[in-house]
């Protein structure tokens, strides 16, 4: 398991909400991405492919999420001070092998200016 701080802007604030960006390498084909708040799993997204190369995307802990070819974004709404915490992107790479787990994260600071409005997408 590789641990580290995100070397990119992990938190993107929108009106009253935050987009948490979890990146993965372009070469990764199949994976599980979990968003952890402290040690608790808040959200997850798993992408796999079948024998016909058909993609399956699953969430056991569902959050509003967005998948691109090198990132998963998880969206948290209605921010308040209780959201301030360490957040981690826990990436399990299934394909290509070998199986690998990486953990990157950062601290989400909540300021009054970010609590002004309710986010609508």
């Amino acid at each position: 398991e590789i641990n580290g701080s995100a070397n990119y802007e992990m938190f993107i604030f929108h009106n009253g909400g935050v987009q948490i960006l979890c990146k993965y390498p372009d070469i990764v084909q199949q994976f599980k991405m979990q968003l952890l708040k402290g040690g608790q799993i808040l959200c997850d997204l798993t992408k796999t492919k079948g024998s016909g190369n058909t993609v399956s995307i699953k969430s056991l802990k569902f959050c509003h999420s967005q998948l691109s070819n090198n990132s998963v974004s998880f969206f948290l709404y209605n921010l308040d001070h209780s959201h301030a915490n360490y957040y981690f992107c826990n990436l399990s790479i299934f394909d290509p092998p070998p199986f690998k787990v990486t953990l990157t994260g950062g601290y989400l600071h909540i300021y009054e200016s970010q609590l002004c409005c309710q986010l609508k997408f």
Epitope: I27, K49, G50, S51, G52, S56, D95
Partner: antibody, heavy 117, light 111 residues
Framework: EVQLVESGGGLVQPGGSLRLSCAAS????????MDWVRQAPGKGLVWVSN????????EYSPFVKGRFTISRDNAKNTLYLQMNSLRAEDTAVYYC??????????WGQGTLVTVSS | DIVMTQSPDSLAVSLGERATINCKSS??????????LTWYQQKPGQPPKLLIF???TRHTGVPDRFSGSGSGTDFTLTISSLQAEDVAVYYC?????????FGPGTKVDIK
């Protein structure tokens, strides 16, 4: 150790039905796509069908589409193949296989289906 | 559907000699960095066994005398020094799209 054990094969008349089962153990069944692959006596391998981790995606070979139905019960760690309107050309050993992300990495021993009058 | 062909249909090789099996697909299996091509070995009376995936990566526990090469539409499985236990039928298989298909197989025997 991954184990896949097929059952339910046998002799059936043309137009008849059979339900194959595959009991899986030694891995987290609900984390994997699963497939059926068949092999006619003395012939090569032919893919039949697959199903994703929770059963929401299924795909079929053109040879069996509309006649066969793949399903799974993750609580019982079991894969199924319901075969209807069977034909003589469906006679084969049917293998249950685990799609291990980039290949069929585990196979059962197979169950023989014979369609004959 | 993508059609997979193999050559030769069968070959006999002396123990310790090199065996080469060719596989051709009717369209390219290359997507991004990956060739969606696998090789399987089936010994008499047994189910198949995964040998090589992504055209050239050996599966866990596969001896290094087995190697895969090629890209696009032309692929090769090589057994560098044939052993008695390598007597089997070898199949190539694509998972580029649905339906995945297998080649007809190549039978390898001892000369």
């Amino acid at each position: 150790e991954v184990q896949l054990v097929e059952s339910g094969g046998g002799l059936v008349q043309p137009g008849g039905s059979l339900r194959l089962s595959c009991a899986a153990s030694g891995f987290t069944f609900s984390d994997y796509w699963m497939d059926w692959v068949r092999q006619a006596p003395g012939k090569g391998l032919v893919w039949v069908s697959n199903i994703d981790e929770d059963g929401s995606i299924t795909e079929y070979s053109p040879f069996v589409k509309g006649r066969f139905t793949i399903s799974r019960d993750n609580a019982k760690n079991t894969l199924y193949l319901q075969m209807n309107s069977l034909r003589a050309e469906d006679t084969a050993v049917y293998y249950c296989t685990r799609w291990g992300r980039f290949g069929f990495d585990s196979w059962g021993q197979g169950t023989l289906v014979t369609v004959s009058s | 559907d993508i059609v997979m062909t193999q050559s030769p249909d069968s070959l006999a090789v002396s123990l310790g000699e090199r065996a080469t099996i060719n596989c051709k697909s009717s369209q390219s299996l290359l997507s991004g960095s990956f060739n969606y091509l696998t090789w399987y070995q089936q010994k008499p009376g047994q189910p198949p066994k995964l040998l090589i995936f992504y055209a050239s990566t050996r599966h866990t526990g596969v001896p290094d005398r087995f190697s895969g090469s090629g890209s696009g539409t032309d692929f090769t499985l090589t057994i560098s020094s044939l052993q008695a236990e390598d007597v089997a039928v070898y199949y190539c298989h694509h998972h580029y799209n649905a339906p995945p298909t297998f080649g007809p197989g190549t039978k390898v025997d001892i000369k």
